[in-house]
């Protein structure tokens, strides 16, 4: 039975040209995290594998940095970066947990961070 929950940074906004940290945290389970995938819609951004470390997809190497922790930093944001981002935790023996973050990249300087919330 999957007992874990993923806490994410929720709905967030950031300024064009700036950077943002996408964060997820898996709690309430003793399952071992074997790999975390970061995806944007159907595109793989990055992988953090427990044995091998990080791998950033070649097309994102210039604008994506690993960390902090299992999070992901997006840099040089453009309006096209607006959309859904997913952290996918591969665990043993539980299976897969997925967290969702919605990022809005704003032209103006009124970007504010949304509240944190939990996805069961």
């Amino acid at each position: 039975m999957m007992t874990g929950t993923i806490e994410t940074t929720g709905n967030i906004s950031a300024e064009k040209g700036g950077s943002i940290i996408l964060q997820c945290h898996l709690s309430s389970t003793t399952a071992q995290v074997t790999q975390v995938n970061w995806e944007q819609q159907d595109q793989l951004l990055a992988i953090c594998n427990a044995d091998l470390g990080w791998h950033i997809s070649p097309s994102f190497k210039d604008r994506v940095a690993p960390g902090p922790g299992l999070g992901l930093t997006l840099q040089s944001l453009t309006v096209n970066d607006t959309g859904e981002y997913f952290c996918i935790y591969h665990t043993y023996p539980d299976g897969t947990y997925t967290g969702r973050i919605f990022l809005e990249v704003l032209e103006s300087s009124v970007a504010e961070h949304g509240a944190r919330f939990q996805i069961p």
Partner: antibody, heavy 121, light 112 residues
Framework: EVQLVESGGGLVQPGGSLRLSCAAS????????MNWVRQAPGKGLEWVSY???????HYADSVKGRFTISRDNAKNSLYLQMNSLRAEDTAVYYC???????????????WGQGTMVTVSS | DIVMTQSPDSLAVSLGERATINCKSS????????????LAWYQQKPGQPPKLLIY???TRESGVPDRFSGSGSGTDFTLTISSLQAEDVAVYYC????????FGGGTKVEIK
């Protein structure tokens, strides 16, 4: 004794195929993440491929789409199917086990003796 | 990919003397969430596979003599052999695994 023994190397023409095997003894391969690492003659080490205990698979960019890693837990063996071989694939191929622990060290603690693959016409 | 640069390429040291090998990574290999440096050291003798000496930059693998020690953090690391023995003649490699694994070019240690 914990041991890894590779086999299947040899001389193959460019564009050809080979299947390497790695037989494990002294431990159960299914409980560990396993890797292939290669070393070109007189050169350094290059990680090639990985398969976890839960069958997550990764490849180095240099072999992606040409090499396939697999394992047979019943035979306690690891395999590397190598297709579309190139001269630059010439190397000693080692199978290597990821060190296990409460917190992953991400280091290779057990290595086989290696098998030589030569790609030449 | 992280590039690992070892220096020197080769090193000749008298028996019983100290040998120091340096390894520099092009990016930090320190993982902030557990404060561990994902840096390992291997010894490879002629005709043999590599042997793990050190992981997490400074943790000695079981059975490795205590004359081998590792130090450093972030991007700069050192392997020290405090008193070189004849059986230590080998090539030594550093390896990072903050990103998918890459190895340094190796340092050949010989007896002067």
């Amino acid at each position: 004794e914990v041991q890894l023994v590779e086999s299947g190397g040899g001389l193959v023409q460019p564009g050809g195929s080979l299947r390497l095997s790695c037989a494990a003894s002294g431990f159960t391969i299914g409980g560990y993440s396993m890797n292939w690492v290669r070393q070109a003659p007189g050169k350094g080490l290059e990680w090639v491929s990985y398969i976890s205990s839960s069958s997550t698979i990764h490849y180095a960019d240099s072999v992606k789409g040409r090499f396939t890693i697999s394992r047979d837990n019943a035979k306690n063996s690891l395999y590397l199917q190598m297709n579309s071989l190139r001269a630059e694939d010439t190397a000693v191929y080692y199978c290597a086990r990821h060190r296990i622990g409460r917190s992953p060290s991400r280091a290779f603690d057990i290595w086989g003796q290696g098998t030589m693959v030569t790609v030449s016409s | 990919d992280i590039v690992m640069t070892q220096s020197p390429d080769s090193l000749a040291v008298s028996l019983g003397e100290r040998a120091t090998i340096n390894c520099k990574s092009s990016q930090s290999v320190l993982f902030s969430s557990n404060n561990k440096n994902y840096l390992a050291w291997y010894q490879q003798k002629p005709g043999q596979p590599p042997k793990l000496l050190i992981y997490w930059a400074s943790t000695r693998e079981s059975g490795v003599p205590d004359r081998f020690s590792g130090s450093g953090s972030g991007t700069d690391f050192t392997l020290t052999i405090s008193s070189l023995q004849a059986e230590d003649v080998a090539v030594y490699y550093c390896q990072q695994s903050y990103f998918f694994p890459t190895f340094g070019g190796g340092t050949k240690v010989e007896i002067k």
